[in-house]
Interface confidence: low
């Protein structure tokens, strides 16, 4: 499942903690928490609730270390317990780590603990009417974070910012080329396609396909983003970044890293008015690569879409559905290209790895 | 608790080694960067070089490229700092310190640091 | 490697004053940038993230904020633990350079 951050995290919240879920709960929102609990625990919570005073709470989740470990899961409304739904195992464990996921759905929470499944809860009052998440017990936490379920991916296609079919040259100059045409965006792998977008209503994603998304005005995506490139690359493997470049930016970059190596280095600079392209390999940097076939394709305070397609000999990227420039592997281990980032003076909308 | 406790510090010659610990505690070390960041004797901070606990990806700063290396163990939750052919420059109280990979817009921001351990390069 | 330039080196202020200490970056660092406090034998605790993001337990009367490469710490109201050093670092391109440090001194 893809995910784009629906709003900042609580970074190290101080417990007991309660803050806003902002546009409140929806259906593909996932929470996840990651923390400590404490080694003398007996208890912790985690509560959904409907504002501060904790009188509405969709969903109590409460693991007891008492009596050999279990969980309370019950929902609280106008101040009334419910019946209690209670899971006699316990997952967690006293003074370790731990990451809780609650994932969000139509009909149920569905909760997983260190990366497995563990219960699901189905909603008992409307799960739109909470706004506010509320933790407390015997627990440190390091953050929670907030990210909603992207689109399904046979709709994303027609959403992407080409004005027109991305335009390759048919063979690398001096080459023979393996393959001959590039494949078009929506014959690429399916199985290994991830999309990080940035939706006004993530409930009712791409309900309509065909209909772009509604992107949101502030930046949704941090800068530095970074994201696992799913498997690595590979040839035929497609990476599209589309954002705004800042209207007083100097410089961006989009490295495609290998661990601690960059693999691609891709590096507008409006001060140069170039775009640079270099690789690193054990904190050294290569020789540069600037000659373009035409303009500088990006501009101060103008949208931007990326293409990078990965081949057996080189990387090929489009900027607007224009071929810019070619790059040849230097780093070879293809599937140990693994992380995308992105960071310098833009915003990001879509990301799709 | 996040704990971070650094060892290893001592007085070593000019042109000798000496390992540096940082013993990690209370959170998922997979998920975090860890740095070494050293502050001379009445000076300011100076950031040397930094671990991806998950990929073992390493940077360093140019000044100790070449003589020190940082690596970790995950099975100790420990990350290590291998200093060699020191110099007198390198006198310093050592820090680590973590940092989460996906923080909010940088992946180097330092939320928990150790106490520090002095290391001192002198004849 | 990009160059934090801290100012001033050192002040010194009374309790209650408000105090503003600036970090300017070589280059285009977006809005990487952190602010640390440090006393004395103790090491830096987090202050400022993403440039004017308040660290979880840090007291509001501690606030940063970015006008280009220029990044500002601003202390609205001194309190007397708030006299320490301070160091703007940017987390932007490796190496992760800091400023040289503001002391904060009683006035």
């Known amino acids: 499942m893809a995910l784009f951050s629906a709003q900042s995290p609580y970074i190290n919240p101080i417990i007991p903690f309660t803050g806003p879920i902002q546009g409140g709960l929806q259906e593909g929102l996932q929470v996840t928490l990651q923390g400590t609990t404490k080694s003398f625990a007996q208890r912790f919570v985690v509560n959904f609730q409907n504002s501060f005073n904790g009188n509405d709470i969709a969903f109590h989740f409460n693991p007891r270390f008492e009596e050999g470990g279990y969980v309370v899961c019950n929902t609280k409304q106008n101040g009334q317990w419910g019946p209690e739904e209670r899971k006699m195992q316990m997952p967690f464990q006293k003074g370790m780590p731990f990451e809780l996921c609650f994932l969000v759905q139509r009909s149920e929470f569905k909760v997983m603990v260190n990366k497995k499944f563990f219960v699901q809860y189905q909603h008992r009052v409307p799960y739109h009417l909470v706004d506010t998440i509320a933790v407390s017990g015997c627990l440190k936490l390091s953050f929670i974070t907030f990210q909603n379920s992207a689109a399904p991916v046979q709709h994303v296609f027609s959403t992407l910012q080409f004005s027109q079919p991305v335009q390759f040259p048919r063979t690398p100059k001096g080459r023979k080329q393996k393959t001959q045409n590039f494949r078009p965006a929506h014959q690429a792998p399916m199985a290994q396609t991830t999309i990080h977008m940035v939706h006004s209503t993530p409930g009712q994603m791409f309900s309509t396909p065909g209909i772009p998304p509604v992107v949101y005005p502030t930046p949704a995506y941090t800068i530095p983003f970074y994201t696992p490139i799913p498997n690595g690359l590979y040839p035929s493997k497609s990476i599209m970044i589309s954002g705004n470049v800042l209207p007083d930016a100097t410089r961006f970059h989009i490295n495609l890293r290998c661990g601690g190596d960059i693999a691609f280095h891709l590096n507008p600079r409006f001060n140069e008015n170039a775009v640079v392209r270099n690789t690193q390999i054990n904190n050294s940097w290569g020789q540069e690569e600037r000659s373009l076939l035409g303009r500088m394709p990006f501009s101060r305070g103008q949208s931007f879409s990326v293409w990078i397609i990965c081949e057996g000999h080189c990387f090929k990227v489009a900027v607007n559905g224009q071929h810019m420039c070619e790059y040849y592997h230097r780093l070879k281990n293809l599937q140990d290209i693994n992380t995308l980032e992105v960071a310098g003076d833009i915003q990001l909308t879509h990301v799709q790895t | 608790e996040v704990q971070l406790v650094e060892s290893g510090g001592g007085l070593v010659q000019p042109g000798g080694s000496l390992r540096l610990s940082c013993a990690a505690s209370g959170f998922t070390f997979h998920s975090y960067w860890i740095h070494w960041v050293r502050q001379a004797p009445g000076k300011g901070l100076e950031w040397v070089a930094r671990?991806?606990?998950?990929?073992?990806?390493?940077y360093y700063a140019d000044s100790v490229k070449g003589r020190f290396t940082i690596s970790a163990d995950t099975s100790k939750n420990t990350a290590y700092l291998q200093m060699n052919s020191l110099r007198a420059e390198d006198t310093a109280v050592y820090y680590c310190?973590?940092?989460?990979?996906?923080?909010?817009?940088?992946?180097?921001?330092?939320?928990?640091w150790g106490q520090g351990t002095l290391v001192t390069v002198s004849s | 490697d990009i160059q934090m330039t801290q100012s001033p080196s050192s002040l010194s202020a009374s309790v209650g004053d408000r105090v503003t200490i600036t970090c300017r970056a070589s280059?285009?660092?977006?809005?990487?940038v952190a602010w640390y406090q440090q006393k004395p034998g103790k090491a830096p605790k987090l202050l400022i993230y993403?440039?004017?993001s308040l660290y979880s337990g840090v007291p509001s009367r501690f606030s940063g904020s970015r006008s280009g490469t220029d990044f500002t710490l601003t202390i609205s109201s001194l309190q007397p633990e708030d006299f320490a050093t301070y160091y703007c670092q940017q987390v932007y391109f490796s190496p992760y350079t800091f400023g040289q440090g503001t002391k904060v001194e009683i006035k």
């Open positions: 671990i991806d606990s998950s990929k073992f990806g390493t």
């Open positions: 993403s440039a004017s």
């Open positions: 280059q285009s660092v977006s809005s990487a």
């Open positions: 310190a973590r940092s989460y990979i996906d923080y909010p817009v940088s992946p180097a921001v330092f939320d928990y």
